[in-house]
């Protein structure tokens, strides 16, 4: 059905402009130009925007990035797909209603160091794992 | 807009019945009963259904499972969210148009052994990594 197609095809957001993305008809969700393959997108996160400026001293923000895009058949080599994702893609192809496509998720994540105040206003320098997306893949 | 809400909320398919899932209006996509949290779902994959029965000798199929569900704020401990996913959830909360929610993906995968014919009709026993979903999380 149109709804199930839309549901599956919209699992990964388009990287088109917001104006294009706002178009709401099912045909637009199906249009091939709206969908790009799973990849890393740049994203800078400001701790001030998150409301964390009162307890994070440094950095003021960081390049977090994010993963987005389609995990559709066939899964190319650059999509870093797992064997399970390949199988799931085939199952989805046979029965889109039953199983979703694999999703575009981080495959490599890096840490960042954060200087912050703890609950007692002591200053802590801590390495936070898995904060920066380095690579994406279909999972 | 309705389209952006639908796009974000449908990134992770509902586990409700297909009949419910077929309802296509935006309001249904927004309904809370349609969305369940990210978790592992059972899925048995038959190699015959995939058309692989001619080259895979054994097993005839396997419990592959798959991941599906919402990665919405707040991310609970059982969602096995990475630090990046927590940050991304907050950024999405602030600006749903700009960044998608994290997606529900495998966090633990197991291997299976497969007995199959190679291109020269030799029988090979090989361990295929990352074939079975053991756990899911928000990534």
């Amino acid at each position: 059905s149109a709804s199930s197609r839309r549901r599956q095809q919209s699992r990964n957001r388009s990287t088109q402009s917001q104006d294009v993305a706002r178009v709401s008809s099912a045909s637009d969700y199906n249009s091939s130009e709206l969908k790009t393959a799973c990849r890393k997108h740049e994203l800078y996160v400001s701790f001030q925007d998150l409301g964390w400026q009162d307890w994070i001293i440094a950095p003021k923000g960081y390049a977090a990035n994010y993963c987005d895009g389609e995990c559709s058949f066939p899964l190319n080599a650059h999509m870093n797909a797992t064997n399970h994702a390949i199988v799931q893609t085939l199952v989805h192809l046979m029965n889109p209603e039953y199983v979703p496509k694999p999703c575009c998720a981080p495959t490599k994540l890096n840490a960042i160091s954060v200087l912050y105040f703890d609950d007692n206003s002591n200053v802590i320098l801590k390495k936070y794992r898995n904060m920066v997306v380095r690579a994406c893949g279909c999972h | 807009s309705a389209s952006s809400r639908r796009r974000q909320q449908s990134r992770n398919r509902s586990t409700q019945s297909q009949d419910v899932a077929r309802v296509s209006s935006a309001s249904d996509y927004n309904s809370s009963e349609l969305k369940t949290a990210c978790r592992k779902h059972e899925l048995y994959v038959s190699f015959q259904d995939l058309g692989w029965q001619d080259w895979i000798i054994a097993p005839k199929g396997y419990a592959a499972n798959y991941c599906d569900g919402e990665c919405s704020f707040p991310l609970n401990a059982h969602m096995n969210a990475t630090n990046h996913a927590i940050v991304q959830t907050l950024v999405h909360l602030m600006n749903p148009e700009y960044v998608p929610k994290p997606c529900c993906a495998p966090t633990k995968l197991n291997a299976i052994s497969v007995l199959y014919f190679d291109d020269n009709s030799n029988v090979i026993l090989k361990k295929y990594r990352n074939m079975v979903v053991r756990a899911c999380g928000c990534h």
Partner: antibody
């Protein structure tokens, strides 16, 4: 190069409120944390508190109930108010910058030249 | 709070001599978050050392810092006439930020 200049009344009556301002030149107040430190005559140094330009503050618990530090980004200034002063609050009051990055935190550099505030009737 | 105890209270030395100043913390100072300052009469303190051992910009290399945990030392390898002053240690890892009582280095 960054310079800090304290200003305010040199004499405050007991039980009144001490008010001082630190004007920052040569740098944006938005880049660092900013602190007040005091030194009673002939004695050691005591940290009063610090502020980030967004308004978040941290105070010395021994003074917290009487102290307010605020910031005015438009004027590149931050201020100290200390209520219910007594003779024990007589001191040279310094403002200072706190470096605040991953590799640099918590030390005071540079300092203002200091201003003597005497609490007396 | 972390109490910093400096010793000796006064150090009487001649120019050219080596000065060793001690700063002992009542509990461990995290990440060696300790600084040393020099203060001359009528002047504001001046940063010498941060991070227990890193020299601040423009500070002569005769000044050096060492130590970790609870015991820290400021060493002036060869005293110059302008080095006679009061020296303070400060910890900035725990709240409240605290200073030692100071060591006065005077001319013998």
């Amino acid at each position: 190069q960054v310079q800090l200049q304290e200003s305010g009344p040199g004499l405050v009556k007991p039980s009144e409120t001490l008010s001082l301002t630190c004007t920052v030149s040569g740098d944006s107040i938005r880049s660092y944390y900013w602190s007040w430190i005091r030194q009673p005559p002939g004695k050691g140094l005591e940290w009063i508190g610090y502020i980030y330009y967004r308004g978040s503050t941290h105070y010395n618990p021994s003074l917290k109930s009487r102290v307010t530090i605020s910031v005015d980004t438009s004027k590149n200034q931050f201020s100290l108010k200390m209520s219910s002063v007594t003779a024990a609050d007589t001191a040279v009051y310094y403002c200072a910058r706190i470096c605040s990055s991953i590799s640099c935190w918590g030390w005071f550099d540079p300092w203002g030249q200091g201003t003597l505030v005497t609490v007396s009737s | 709070e972390i109490v910093l105890t400096q010793s000796p209270g006064t150090l009487s030395l001649s120019p050219g001599e080596r000065a060793t100043l001690s700063c002992r913390a009542s509990q461990s100072v995290s990440s060696s978050y300790l600084a040393w300052y020099q203060q001359k009469p009528g002047q504001a303190p001046r940063l010498l050392i941060y991070g227990a051992s890193s020299r601040a910009t423009g500070i002569p290399d005769r000044f050096s810092g060492s130590g970790s945990g609870t015991d820290f030392t400021l060493t002036i390898s060869r005293l110059e006439p302008e080095d006679f002053a009061v020296y303070y240690c400060q910890q900035y890892g725990s709240s409240p930020l605290t200073f030692g009582g100071g060591t006065k280095v005077e001319i013998k």
